[in-house]
């Protein structure tokens, strides 16, 4: 494949990362899916720059980011070390609450509406954002 | 690689109290609920108790509620159990757990007089 | 409470036998169920989350398929490895519980 130069159509282009952002709602699962139909991955935040970067764009809405821990250690969707990474939970997350009464805990990480994150059950339909990277090898067959 | 090691466990007459301690590390501890199940000797799982990872949340078997206390020092990586009014159906090997994925080794508590 | 029970209580079963370990919940518990494998002496080990989810790490030869009440775990090719005490657990509420075990020895 070729390598992608320049953001799709309808992507916001940052420090050599495109960006989608949604403004329908979905579950996490199905989020993570939409955006690797799209060659991307939900967003990863590896800095405090790019997290008030997605901040703005999202506003004060809950949405996803590629964050869980479904098998036990929190994990980034594309294999960031979530241990040596960047962290901007709320105070007291994550905490796998259970309370909500819709039946297992919470293991699907979003921003909350002051951005800082927070842990929630995966099934909720929240917006969702998907970032590829730049000069990655695109799946697409370059134009002749 | 993650590392749960569990302490505090030995010979206790009924009645008396022990605090198991389980010393982490390897993660970001206060990212995780910890747990403690349990086995009695020759027999199956029992879980017994968990914690969020900030301590705001904590959940007990009704076989121990009333006698035993889960807590959590996240400043030292350990979670305990303070386990009073101990009784001969108390004995076991206690296993921290991890986000019920990732186990100690265990420690053997004997309730016996 | 969730009551967990399994069967068979044990089996025998040679090397290379496919073997099927039943799991039932006493309620609703959608696919908040995990098997671990457990060796005399040993804790216990993670196979399978959420019903279906293969742990990382644990062979192709393990698979799990369930959902609601009913559930099953599955191994392809018996080898002497697998000869251990299976467990199902519910984490769909607190308290969590574990089915009464399962022992596979050899025939």
């Known amino acids: 494949g070729s390598e992608r130069t320049c953001c799709p159509v309808n992507w916001v282009e940052h420090e050599r990362s495109c960006y989608w952002f949604s403004r329908s709602g979905k579950a996490w699962a199905d989020a993570d899916n939409y955006c690797r139909l799209e060659d991307a991955h939900l967003v990863v935040v590896t800095s405090w720059e790019e997290q008030k970067f997605v901040q703005h764009h999202i506003g004060p809405v809950n949405t996803w980011m590629g964050l869980h821990d479904q098998n036990g250690p929190w994990k980034w969707v594309d294999g960031t070390d979530y241990e040596t990474g960047f962290k901007n939970w709320r105070p007291e997350q994550p905490d796998d609450w259970y309370g909500h009464g819709l039946g297992g805990g919470e293991d699907c990480a979003h921003f909350t509406d002051d951005g800082r994150w927070n842990d929630d059950v995966c099934q909720r339909p929240y917006r969702w954002v998907c970032e590829t990277e730049l000069d990655k090898a695109s799946q697409e067959p370059p134009l002749l | 690689e993650v590392q749960l090691l569990e302490s505090g466990g030995g010979l206790v007459q009924p009645g008396g109290s022990l605090r198991l301690s389980c010393a982490a590390s390897g993660f970001t501890f206060s990212s995780y609920v910890m747990s403690w199940v349990r086995q009695a000797p020759g027999k199956g799982l029992e879980w017994v108790s968990a914690m969020s990872g900030s301590g705001g949340h904590t959940y007990y078997a009704d076989s121990v509620k009333g006698r035993f206390t889960i807590s959590r020092d996240n400043s030292k990586n350990t979670v305990y159990l303070q386990m009073n009014s101990l009784r001969a159906e108390d004995t076991a090997v206690y296993y921290c757990?991890?986000?019920?994925?990732?186990w100690g080794q265990g420690t053997l508590v004997t309730v016996s007089s | 409470d969730i009551q967990m029970t399994q069967s068979p209580s044990s089996l025998s079963a040679s090397v290379g036998d496919r073997v099927t370990i039943t799991c039932r919940a006493s309620?609703?518990?959608?696919?908040?169920l995990a098997w671990f494998q457990q060796k005399p002496g040993k804790a216990p080990t993670s196979l399978i989350y959420a019903s279906s989810s293969l742990q990382s790490g644990v062979p192709s030869k393990f698979s799990g398929s369930g959902s609601g009440t009913d559930f099953t775990l599955t191994i392809s090719s018996l080898q002497p490895e697998d000869f251990a005490t299976y467990y199902c657990?519910?984490?769909?509420?607190?308290?969590?519980?574990f089915g009464p075990g399962t022992k596979v020895d050899i025939r």
């Open positions: 657990q519910q984490y769909h509420s607190y308290p969590f519980t």
């Open positions: 757990v991890k986000h019920g994925y990732s």
């Open positions: 309620q609703d518990i959608n696919n908040y």
